[in-house]
């Protein structure tokens, strides 16, 4: 009796962070014995799609012409083969943005600062929202995701980081997005600049809890420091 | 063209069971996912149960789990629904409907068989 | 458990625009829902208009879509014809389960 069938690797290209009305196209890679690969959303009621292998048959394309709210969320994929179905993928997430205008990203008291003392980014959102991401330009993940106690909405959320060191410096951008939906996202903010300068370097922060990556030291989130923020939203970690 | 046909209902006495059958024909059953839907006298429409098109995935309404069973045979083209213990508000006409290939490509419920009438009393 | 509640009937004149709703009691329907339209003529026979990721079902004219206003889903006629009157149902999927609306009789005045 052979074992379960290895499972299939499943990727998003250009990436899985994607503006509405844009193309996306979802990779299924299985093995060369593949008959059909399939698509499976979460919480669908049926598969959501079903291609037949590209040759030399060991994997296939899913495409999305044009991206809406409809494909925004997690999916699997998996292959049928003469014995069956394989294991499922890992999960994709296929985040869409531009569902909500976009958020004003500053930084208080000012995006030019000394390193050693305390910077806060503060994201705010014309309408009433419950989750706040904070990205910076290169990193491998959102570096910070605020959501609001018990669905309540806000209008704005504090990134603080404190102490600043040379390594905070870089482009940063948010986004805003309601609960219902964590593959809905806003518009991207304008982006900042945060100028770190002086020589007052310290230690590297140390992130309140880790995640882990496959980048480069450079690329490692950067987790803020600091107490609630005064939005009354509370650090909810992916 | 596609043809749904319910058969097996009739009278059965409250807690005795029916097993219903929807031949399908017309279409390749086996690339499509089914449903059971039921209309009681003078009601709406009630969906019961899903299953998908190799019958991975099945999903009931709590008023019937753990009573009624969805199944298929796709060498035989037939989709069924096992009812057990029945209950007198299960009367109704109860038919079968096509779901879709996948989400991208088709609509659920597109075609119906004519229904076949259940009527539970004692 | 969800309640789907539809117009109980609306009446409509040939070439007249008419559309109708479908509400959730759990609140504002979404595309996670993939609200379906039935139409169902006399004698019982139902047919699939509009779901899945809105697609149209083969032979279904133009006239008929499907959207989300608000906070329901609606079917939109556009220049209704004496033909469309039936009984509409919309189901609305809730993460295991469908759940069917009481439908809304349409009358097209002749």
């Known amino acids: 009796q052979a074992g379960p069938l290895p499972k299939p690797t499943l990727w998003a290209e250009p990436g899985s962070v994607i503006s509405w009305g844009n193309s996306v196209t979802i990779w299924c890679q299985g093995t060369l014995e593949a008959r059909e690969y399939r698509l499976d959303k979460e919480e669908s009621p049926a598969p959501w799609d079903r291609q037949n292998p590209l040759e030399p048959k060991n994997k296939a394309r899913f495409s999305i012409p044009s991206m809406t709210e409809d494909y925004a969320g997690r999916y699997r994929c998996y292959y049928r083969s003469p014995v069956g179905w394989s294991q499922p993928s890992d999960p994709l997430e296929l985040v869409m943005t531009g569902a909500y205008s976009k958020p004003t990203l500053s930084a208080l008291p000012s995006p030019l600062v000394t390193s050693g003392k305390s910077v806060t980014l503060l994201c705010q959102s014309r309408s009433p929202m419950d989750t706040f991401l904070l990205i910076k330009e290169r990193a491998a993940h959102p570096l910070l995701h605020l959501r609001s106690e018990h669905g309540a909405q806000q209008h704005q959320a504090e990134f603080p980081m404190s102490p600043v060191t040379s390594v905070h410096g870089g482009t940063y951008r948010c986004f805003s997005s309601h609960g219902f939906s964590h593959y809905l996202l806003s518009h991207p903010s304008d982006p900042l600049e945060l100028i770190v300068s002086g020589s007052l370097e310290g230690p590297r922060p140390s992130p309140t809890r880790s995640v882990s990556t496959a980048a480069g030291p450079e690329d490692q989130p950067l987790m803020p420091t600091g107490s609630v923020p005064h939005s009354g939203l509370r650090r909810h970690w992916e | 063209q596609v043809q749904l046909v319910e058969s097996g209902g009739g009278v059965v006495q409250p807690g005795r069971s029916l097993r219903l059958s929807c031949a399908a024909s017309?279409?390749?059953?086996?690339?499509?996912?089914m449903h059971w839907v039921r209309q009681a006298p003078g009601k709406g429409l009630e969906w019961m149960a899903g299953?998908?098109?190799?019958?991975?995935?099945?999903y009931y309404i709590d008023s019937v789990k753990g009573r009624f069973t969805i199944s298929r045979d796709n060498s035989k083209n037939t989709l069924y629904l096992q009812m057990n213990n029945l209950r007198a508000e299960d009367t109704a006409v109860y038919y079968c409907?096509?779901?879709?290939?996948?989400?991208?490509?088709?609509?659920?419920?597109?075609?119906w068989g004519q229904g076949t009438l259940v009527t539970v009393s004692s | 458990d969800a309640v789907v509640t539809q117009e109980s009937a609306l009446t409509t004149s040939p070439g007249e625009t008419v559309t109708l709703t479908c509400r959730s009691s759990?609140?504002?329907?979404?595309?996670?829902?993939?609200a379906n339209w039935v139409q169902e003529k006399p004698d019982h026979l139902f047919t699939g208009l509009i779901g899945?990721?809105?697609n149209r079902a083969p032979g279904v004219p133009a006239r008929f879509s499907g959207s989300l206003i608000g906070d329901k889903a609606a079917l939109t006629i556009t220049g209704a014809q004496t033909e469309d009157e039936a009984i509409y149902f919309c189901?609305?999927?809730?993460?295991?389960?469908?759940?069917f609306g009481g439908g809304t009789k349409l009358t097209v005045l002749g």
């Open positions: 409907a096509r779901d879709v290939i996948s989400m991208v490509r088709g609509v659920p419920f597109d075609y």
């Open positions: 017309g279409f390749t059953f086996s690339n499509y996912g």
């Open positions: 299953i998908w098109f190799d019958g991975t995935n099945k």
């Open positions: 759990t609140g504002a329907v979404t595309t996670s829902n993939y």
């Open positions: 899945g990721i809105n």
């Open positions: 189901a609305l999927w809730y993460s295991n389960h469908w759940v």
